[in-house]
Amino acid sequence: SQPQAVPPYASENQTCRDQEKEYYEPQHRICCSRCPPGTYVSAKCSRIRDTVCATCAENSYNEHWNYLTICQLCRPCDPVMGLEEIAPCTSKRKTQCRCQPGMFCAAWALECTHCELLSDCPPGTEAELKDEVGKGNNHCVPCKAGHFQNTSSPSARCQPHTRCENQGLVEAAPGTAQSDTTCKNPLEPLPPEMSGTMLM
């Protein structure tokens, strides 16, 4: 079997064996090593010497195998765009951002660039639970049978109707999707002015 070529090596067809970790250098028509994440090219390759890499300076990073001669500036998450930091920048990774609580990603360009407030879900509904927080706006779904939700809110969850008998009470009015069951003392008639749940 042929020995594996080690950079730098000649390439007539302008392609390299390992596209992730090597690149074609057209001036010398050779394949050279890229620099690993967290580093940059401090000396370009030649026919007799491979790429020389150096570590990114403080406050900078390179995320991928690269042939950049410089590193990218670490930047903060922009709070005005509704973003917050979940992990600081390192030499190998840019600052990791996510939408602030109560917001969703409204503009995506390789990563989230702009978050907006989640829409309210009206009474009788709740936001459908998503796999990933902040990924999309609220999709409001009706409360399931036996549950209610009585506010306009982006995050309120449907709650089970009160079971009057559990409290030694009797039902005065059934619960709806927007209101809880109304309970009363079994010994007393419900006064006309009383509306809403009787709390023990």
Partner: antibody, heavy 120, light 113 residues
Framework: QVQLVQSGAEVKKPGSSVKVSCKAS????????ISWVRQAPGQGLEWMGG????????NYAQKFQGRVTITADKSTSTAYMELSSLRSEDTAVYYC?????????????WGQGTTVTVSS | DIVMTQSPDSLAVSLGERATINCKSS????????????LAWYQQKPGQPPKLLIY???TRESGVPDRFSGSGSGTDFTLTISSLQAEDVAVYYC?????????FGQGTKVEIK
């Protein structure tokens, strides 16, 4: 020493387009973001957008979105800024600029500027 | 975008006197993780492109005379020329690079009184 040399002055009619070039020498062209900044007569500096040649991705100011196109040709170490649907308010000096210490940091190298006059 | 506001718009100072220019950003340009302010100052003379004077709010670019100094943090910044020279007559701009959408102040014109 890094140098950014821009194309010559242009006179354009309203509604037409202009394409300004910026040729870099003395440094690694593709590793640095090139920004375009304009300055109307007697006015301040206004960032229009930029491109990282090695990635080919451009990034535009909201004000110019849809009207400006920034490109780069790595083989000639040249960046281009094309502005369409020209109006008289686009009369300005257009500069290309790039950082030196970071790929996308503060701007420390500037071209000499290209005067674009929009007049009927 | 971050809005940068400079004051005053123009300033007349006697030769050898101190000139002070202020710059305010609409939001903080301080990155708490590295405690750096993403702010630069530029000088522009008539018919010339801008020239970088200061970055990281207070670090002088090499070759810039030490009479130029930058200070401030968060949203409030100052460029000081400790002893104005004739060659300092120019327009001065602050600029943020906290986001990749760079923005500039409207400029402050410095003249000799």
């Amino acid at each position: 020493q890094v140098q950014l040399v821009q194309s010559g002055a242009e006179v354009k009619k309203p509604g037409s387009s202009v394409k300004v070039s910026c040729k870099a020498s003395g440094g690694t062209f593709s590793s640095y973001a090139i920004s375009w900044v304009r300055q109307a007569p007697g006015q301040g500096l206004e960032w229009m957008g930029g491109i990282i040649p090695i990635h080919g991705t451009a990034n535009y100011a909201q004000k110019f979105q849809g009207r400006v196109t920034i490109t780069a040709d790595k083989s000639t170490s040249t960046a281009y800024m094309e502005l369409s649907s020209l109006r008289s308010e686009d009369t300005a000096v257009y500069y290309c600029a790039r950082p030196s210490y970071y790929l996308d940091g503060w701007l420390d190298y500037w071209g000499q500027g290209t005067t674009v006059t929009v007049s009927s | 975008d971050i809005v940068m506001t400079q004051s005053p718009d123009s300033l007349a100072v006697s030769l050898g006197e101190r000139a002070t220019i202020n710059c305010k950003s609409s939001q903080s340009v301080l990155y708490s993780s590295n405690n750096k302010n993403y702010l630069a100052w530029y000088q522009q003379k008539p018919g010339q492109p801008p020239k970088l004077l200061i970055y990281w709010a207070s670090t002088r670019e090499s070759g810039v005379p030490d009479r130029f100094s930058g200070s401030g943090s968060g949203t409030d910044f100052t460029l000081t020329i400790s002893s104005l020279q004739a060659e300092d007559v120019a327009v001065y701009y602050c600029s943020q690079y906290y986001t990749t959408h760079y923005t500039f102040g409207q400029g402050t014109k410095v003249e000799i009184k």
